[in-house]
Amino acid sequence: MACPLEKALDVMVSTFHKYSGKEGDKFKLNKSELKELLTRELPSFLGKRTDEAAFQKLMSNLDSNRDNEVDFQEYCVFLSCIAMMCNEFFEGFPDKQPRKK
Amino acid sequence: MACPLEKALDVMVSTFHKYSGKEGDKFKLNKSELKELLTRELPSFLGKRTDEAAFQKLMSNLDSNRDNEVDFQEYCVFLSCIAMMCNEFFEGFPDKQPRKK
């Protein structure tokens, strides 16, 4: 059976393609695909920020090659940023044990 | 219940701290901690590459700030690289559906 970290990487890849294949370039997320991914797969990150300007800003921040889409590399950078935010929270509570899966 | 992608990010964080806290700086992986993490948590990635020179080379590639340790940001870059390798494999088989979790 795959280890949890390998499963986690597999989830990162499969989640991207679950949404990227819906419209246009099947290997990139356009704005509506990104919005759907965030809303359904990262609700804790998104919170109440569902207004159009917030999505536009996020899209712009992720889209480093400025093609109005988020490719897999840009998506990985995004997930790494969220992971680093989670890690900062974790390191702020050094006695807190990692949640057991 | 947390969504699979949120769980995946949690696993990324918790796996790092499971090993980083064993010796020295508890928020960084030294070479032996990294070796143990790779061997136990990413056996598919590691494969047969268990020789010392390979570990040294990997450690050197990950350690972008040259402090002989891998911090969380460097670890995220590493995982992103593995995810991108997995994604390239995935995109090479466009008809392959994402594995359902």
Partner: antibody, heavy 120, light 107 residues
Framework: DVQLQESGPGLVKPSQSLSLTCSVT?????????WNWIRQFPGSKLEWMGH???????NYNPSLKNRISITRDTSKNQFFLRLTSVTTEDTATYYC?????????????WGQGTLVTVSA | DIQMTQSPSSLSASVGDRVTITCRAS??????LNWYQQKPGKAPKLLLY???RLHSGVPSRFSGSGSGTDYTLTISSLQPEDFATYYC?????????FGGGTKVEIK
């Protein structure tokens, strides 16, 4: 309101470097915008040169790639253009612009422009 | 690079006229098309972005349409302050590229 102001020498000798500064007021270098350099040649043709944005991400026009450098100083709300090995073909009005985060990333604010003449 | 071709390069019109300017891209730009107005001695000003969205403060007599490679800017009733040069610009991919401009002159 956002205002951009270009500054720098109006005359540059061939083979030398052109250096311009854009000072931004009314907005800070937030992660939401990219900051661009665009030039307009005497015949009115507009050319996008490059930009700097989120996390210091930089993109250049490939036609200038070996000669151009864009940097910024977030503490001063300024960004800079350096173009090396200039020729008379680089004579143009140089504009600094802000690139919006909206669809298509339009240039929503422009400086008034500064004319740079390359001549011996 | 994506080439942007504007037509006509100039036109003469009278106040109150309906004016149409076209812009053609060398490949599909997926509606990522922006329009600018420039008056002599001034910097260009954004009019419309993403084909048809009006930038704040721009009068509603300006409108845009199109898809794929072909796009249009329309001024429904030309006003004296509209005599200027108009540029299209693709925001689909890098490097950003502009059309050659259309000069709208008084007939």
């Amino acid at each position: 309101d956002v205002q951009l102001q270009e500054s720098g020498p109006g005359l540059v000798k061939p083979s030398q470097s052109l250096s311009l500064t854009c000072s931004v007021t009314g907005d800070s270098f937030t992660n939401d915008y990219y900051w661009n350099w665009i030039r307009q040649f005497p015949g009115s043709k507009l050319e996008w040169m490059g930009h700097i944005g989120y996390g210091g991400n930089i993109n250049y026009n490939p036609s200038l790639k070996n000669r151009i450098s864009i940097t910024r100083d977030t503490s001063k709300n300024q960004f800079f253009l350096r173009l090396t090995s200039v020729t008379t073909e680089d004579t143009a009005t140089y504009y600094c612009t802000r690139e919006s985060f909206y669809d298509g990333y339009p240039f929503d604010y422009w400086g008034q422009g500064t004319l740079v003449t390359v001549s011996a | 690079d994506i080439q942007m071709t504007q037509s006509p390069s100039s036109l003469s019109a009278s106040v109150g006229d309906r004016v149409t300017i076209t812009c053609r891209a060398s490949q599909d730009i997926r509606n990522y098309l922006n329009w600018y107005q420039q008056k002599p001695g001034k910097a260009p000003k954004l009019l419309l972005y993403y084909t048809s969205r009006l930038h704040s403060g721009v009068p509603s007599r300006f409108s845009g349409s199109g898809s794929g490679t072909d796009y249009t800017l329309t001024i429904s009733s030309l006003q004296p302050e509209d005599f200027a040069t108009y540029y299209c610009q693709q925001g689909n991919s890098l490097p950003r590229t502009f059309g050659g401009g259309t000069k709208v002159e008084i007939k």
